[in-house]
Amino acid sequence: MAPWPELGDAQPNPSKYLEGATSQQPITPDKSKETNKTDNTEVPVTKFELLPTYSTATLIEEPTEVDDPWNLPTLQDSGIKWSERDAKGKILCVFQGIGRLILLLGFLYFFVCSLDVLSSAFQLVGGKMAGQFFSNSSIMSNPLLGLVIGVLVTVFVQSSSTSTSIVVSMVASSLLTVRAAIPIIMGANIGTSITNTIVALMQVGDRSEFRRAFAGATVHDFFNWLSVLVLLPVEVATHYLEVVTQLIVESFHFKNGEDAPDLLKVITKPFTKLIVQLDKKVISQIAMNDETAKNKSLVKIWCKTFTNMTQMNVTVPSMANCTSHSLCWTDGIQIWTMKNVTYKENIAKCQHIFVNFHLPDLAVGIILLIISLLVLCGCLIMIVKILGSVLKGQVATVIKKTINTDFPFPFAWLTGYLAILVGAGMTFIVQSSSVFTSALTPLIGIGVITIERAYPLTLGSNIGTTTTAILAALASPGNTLRSSLQIALCHFFFNISGILLWYPIPFTRLPIRMAKGLGNISAKYRWFAVFYLIIFFFLIPLTVFGLSLAGWPVLVGVGVPVVFIIILVLCLRLLQSRCPRVLPKKLQNWNFLPLCMHSLKPWDAVISKFTGPFQMPCCCCCRVCCRVCCLLCGCPKCCRCSKCCQDLEEGQEAQGVPVKAPETFDNITISREAQGEVRAPDSKTECTAL
């Protein structure tokens, strides 16, 4: 088990490594560089040389006066001041603003829709398998297995509400006890945090942006993992969640409510149901060991059906099974009786793309997975671009101050709790923590929201998603009301307990520190982000699942040494950083281990070797896409990948050596003359650069 990898080469003061930087042009953050195209072109620009040893991201991203890479970038206003505009310019500026707002809302809408379709795609690809996970009898006795099943199923179906509703129906039909369901709910809480981590991966193109976005997304993961790490053993030992929720449920005087509010779904459903509609009951039926459901398709074909109660002739094994003594006969071969059966008549087909294709679920799932990821990625890029152009100068200052500033003393501590309430409220409105946290991720990336502020918003989001579940439980039918309410309350109190553990005392805000650490590593070795995703959401849960199936002795036999090594490494790491003198000289650092066990550098070299051959075609594709993008938006400077690809090609021609994979996406700062993209701004039409 290697210790937490360190950022060996991160430079605290980038200005030391810059030559020829003039006072006329400070090294601005990348965001402002990108949007600075309307500046007066007469400003002298000095080309500076970078000393070769360090990654350009570390040197360029942050301003010279800033030491902390986590400080938000200055989003400079490059537009013409309002007072300097003529009437036509002002009108155009207003229209441009409205246009941007409409575009932003449009892309946000499709972003949310693509998340919904992505969830459907995952259900089509892995839903049936997810259902079969639940029908495993070992869940009852093994809380650890329950936990990983919760994680895996939620990851596979990309929806904690789907996995939770399966659990509810299983508890309601006595296939699962509430005690056995609690670890699954905890696992579902972890699994749901993968969505915004995937969204963060979309911002991999810009190192500093990616550092912030990835840390902002994984703060959710770490909160959930740490909460489970503490609360699962506590729950297994004391059953406090089960006991507390049972007391609450028993104090209720049940009366079936009305349907839970749909809110955001009201807007997105009309569009997403034109793409695909799923029969969610199938997954639940598989989980409840219904053999017939295994052959059913998840893709809904008939949307309008008529259910009629009718007397039907059915075969029975013997006369004893006849519904009534008189209504029984034989045709000489089979014994028949009359039974009241509900007969479902199909009236109208659904109106979605896949209704008449009769493709297997896997095929539909893969098609939707690709499309939804492309739309998600495209929308995210456009949202980031539009926000980047809108959130500058005064607007940026106001927004950043509003979101990130604390209340005046002595009420500063209340700000975070207000953020928790805001997060809960927003999640309740959008009816999905995934949607809220995924929308938050690009804002963290571009520097509008700090990670310190994103953390309570995310915690609030966790609470918000449980209030939705409580409302849905109160609206559920009598047979599932008790179990669904108890499970929803377990989910709620689990998140409340997690907040009490990891938020009130600033010292305990461990998820922030862990997420920042991961953000730093992922910014330097971007492949590590994908590794983290695979390891934490797939490999570890699947390994635990496999070991649990093998039985407790195997799980303990493998688990105890692994946990022991992790604790040993953590203790050693703590002593190394706090009081290294206590340790023998050899243990004061990790150099006694092979390099590959305490640094990602050797691994980076290996991965670069594998990814090297894919860089050229990737870059060619990137350049074509960028040029098209530039033509469409009419902005020749928005596109940075073509330059980096050019450098890559030149480097390869000169040396015949493949360039390291992570550098492919670096933002190389060059003068505008060198780019050959100098153009005088149209003072009349340009409000702020898109």
């Epitope: 002739n313 003594h325 006969w329 034989t330 045709d331 000489g332 014994i335």
Partner: antibody, heavy 120, light 107 residues
């Protein structure tokens, strides 16, 4: 219209076997059960057995088991009854009749009958 | 096996008369009884099923009744074309069994 047309009369020696066919038309063969009933001269009706052509499930009266085989050919909508180890008491008119599957309407259509004479 | 006994074994009647044929099952058969008509030299024809339901195309003068063990077939007004042998059949349990038949003649 509904028709069940049986093969012609047969004269057989004791110990031999006879195969009677029943070609159907005018209805969905697989939706019905085909029964075989015999009538000895001057006697009542005796049920032999039945077959569901859709899945080839059969049932026979106890005293015919092992001697009778009912088959059905879906492609030609034809049912067959083979009776082996013939005895003189097997001399009778053999009828095929249809019975609507999953329905209690009994044998609503009959073939014209096939006379089987067993004599040495 | 369920035994089905029919009475009378034969009867002679006049055109326009009312005729009743009875059928008794050895055990309760509910309403799983059918009546067939077999004219001389012809194959049987279904008249009544489920004890009282008239088959398609069967004249209204034929009515069936009864449940449990006792069943009757009534011809309200005998016509010359009704000269035939009438069989009752139970289909409550396998094997399917028939009555010996009632021969109806016109004087």
């Amino acid at each position: 219209q509904v028709q069940l047309v049986q093969s012609g009369a047969e004269v057989k020696k004791p110990g031999s076997s006879v195969k009677v066919s029943c070609k159907t038309s005018g209805f969905f063969f697989t939706e019905y059960i085909i029964h075989w009933v015999r009538q000895a001269p001057g006697q009542g009706l005796e049920w032999i057995g039945g077959i569901i052509p859709n899945n080839d499930v059969t049932n026979y009266k106890q005293n015919f088991r092992g001697r009778v085989t009912l088959t059905a050919d879906k492609s030609t909508s034809t049912a067959y009854m083979e009776l082996s180890s013939l005895r003189s008491e097997d001399t009778a008119v053999y009828y095929c009749a249809r019975w609507r599957n999953a329905y209690y309407s009994a044998m609503d259509s009959w073939g014209q009958g096939t006379t089987v004479t067993v004599s040495s | 096996d369920i035994q089905v006994t029919q009475s009378p074994s034969s009867l002679s009647t006049s055109v326009g008369d009312r005729v009743t044929i009875t059928c008794t099952a050895s055990q309760d058969v509910g309403t799983a009884v059918a009546w067939y008509q077999q004219k001389p030299g012809k194959s049987p024809k279904l008249l009544i099923y489920w004890a009282s339901t008239r088959h398609t195309g069967v004249p209204e003068r034929f009515t069936g009744s009864g449940s449990g063990t006792d069943f009757t077939l009534t011809i309200s007004s005998v016509q010359p074309e009704d000269v035939a042998t009438y069989f009752c059949q139970q289909y409550r349990t396998s094997p399917l069994t028939f009555g010996v038949g009632t021969k109806v003649e016109i004087k």
